[in-house]
């Protein structure tokens, strides 16, 4: 089915979502003051091999458990990221972004990353994939 | 029952190398990270570094850096902290401590009972 | 790297005695309305214990006679009726900053 302008403002929408989610995150815990960021930085992240359709959300997917467990560690009295309802949220709109009609399997680079460098490469994803809708 | 078991007492020469172990047990060992911390006869206590057992990602003080080495087995509970040509100013008190982050704290809950290392000619 | 300064270096108390130790950071130790302060005892030849974190909080299992206190740079570890068990050496922790740094211990020994 070819894809409308409603169904793309819809896929725009989910993905500035996510995009804002991620950003809140990274936000979050990429300040140099953050007591945890050292320790946070010792995780590890599967990245995609390649990352330039929806489908390819499916390597997100897979590492949302080890980005809540490092979120985890996150939390203060002023910043309340509530990871489970977090990572959750992203869930949701990580499955209506990529379907579930194929199955795809994530391929992934050699290199492991930390939590900053998997963020901002999801990031990445999510603005050029935006980029390409408007 | 959570802790952590240390191996035993080492006597070494100088320019020696050595390893010592810190066993974890009662808990998912992969959960938590694995802190190393110093105590010179004596003297209070010194931070060294810590490991992800999970990931194997350090971070060490800069104090520390390329003077010892931590790595762990996961696949057998254990940190290690290694030596790669002693010095006498290496003899002391080595302890691994547990590492809790969660919500708002940064403690070491649980502590091994400590390695002593003697480096003497 | 922060240095803790903890006072006095060591003192002789009784059984009973009403013991405060304090800890003064080179620079606060806050961090979004969170103090990363902790405090632990060490008894001669034993690994350190947990007593407090987070400034306040009580390590389960450790007496209530402990209670701590303080934010930004000034601590307080207060034992209020000292036992004979608590004869130790105590320090504070700050672990808001890398390295996590140690104060240089409080001995508290039987007048």
């Known amino acids: 089915m070819a894809p409308t302008s409603s169904s793309t403002k819809k896929t725009q929408l989910q993905l500035e979502h996510l995009l804002l989610d991620l950003q809140m995150i990274l936000n979050g815990i990429n300040n140099y003051k953050n007591p945890k960021l050292t320790r946070m930085l010792t995780f590890k992240f599967y990245m995609p091999k390649k990352a330039t359709e929806l489908k390819h959300l499916q390597c997100l997917e897979e590492e949302l458990k080890p980005l809540e467990e490092v979120l985890n560690l996150a939390q203060s009295k002023n910043f309340h990221l509530r990871p489970r309802d977090l990572i959750s949220n992203i869930n949701v709109i990580v499955l209506e972004l990529k379907g579930s009609e194929t199955t795809f399997m994530c391929e992934y680079a050699d290199e492991t990353a930390t939590i900053v460098e998997f963020l901002n490469r999801w990031i990445t994803f999510s603005q050029s994939i935006i980029s390409t809708l408007t | 029952e959570v802790q952590l078991v240390q191996s035993g007492a080492e006597v070494k020469k100088p320019g020696e190398s050595l390893k010592i172990s810190c066993k974890g047990s009662?808990?998912?060992?992969?959960?938590?990270?694995i802190e190393w911390v110093r105590q010179m006869p004596g003297k209070g206590l010194e931070w060294m570094g810590v490991i992800n057992p999970g990931s194997g990602g350090t971070y060490y003080n800069e104090k520390f850096k390329g003077q010892v080495t931590i790595s762990a087995d996961k696949s057998i509970s254990t940190a290690y902290l290694q030596w790669s040509s002693l010095k006498a100013s290496d003899t002391a008190m080595y302890y691994c401590?547990?590492?809790?982050?969660?919500?708002?704290?940064?403690?070491?809950?649980?502590w091994g009972q400590g390695t002593t290392v003697t480096v003497s000619s | 790297a922060i240095r803790l300064t903890q006072s006095p270096s060591s003192f002789s108390a009784s059984t009973g005695d009403r013991v405060t130790i304090t800890c003064k950071a080179s620079?606060?130790?806050?961090?979004?309305?969170?103090?990363?302060m902790n405090w632990y005892q060490q008894k001669p030849g034993k690994a350190p214990k947990l007593l407090i974190y987070?400034?306040?909080n009580l390590e389960s299992g450790v007496p209530s006679r402990f209670s701590g206190s303080g934010s930004g740079t000034d601590f307080t570890l207060t034992i209020s009726s000292l036992q004979s068990e608590d004869f130790a050496t105590y320090y504070c922790q700050q672990s808001n900053e890398d390295p996590y740094t140690f104060g240089g211990g409080t001995k508290v020994e039987i007048k």
């Open positions: 620079q606060s130790v806050d961090y979004q309305g969170d103090s990363y």
């Open positions: 987070s400034a306040s």
């Open positions: 401590a547990r590492w809790r982050g969660e919500g708002y704290y940064a403690y070491f809950d649980v």
């Open positions: 009662g808990y998912a060992f992969t959960n938590y990270l």
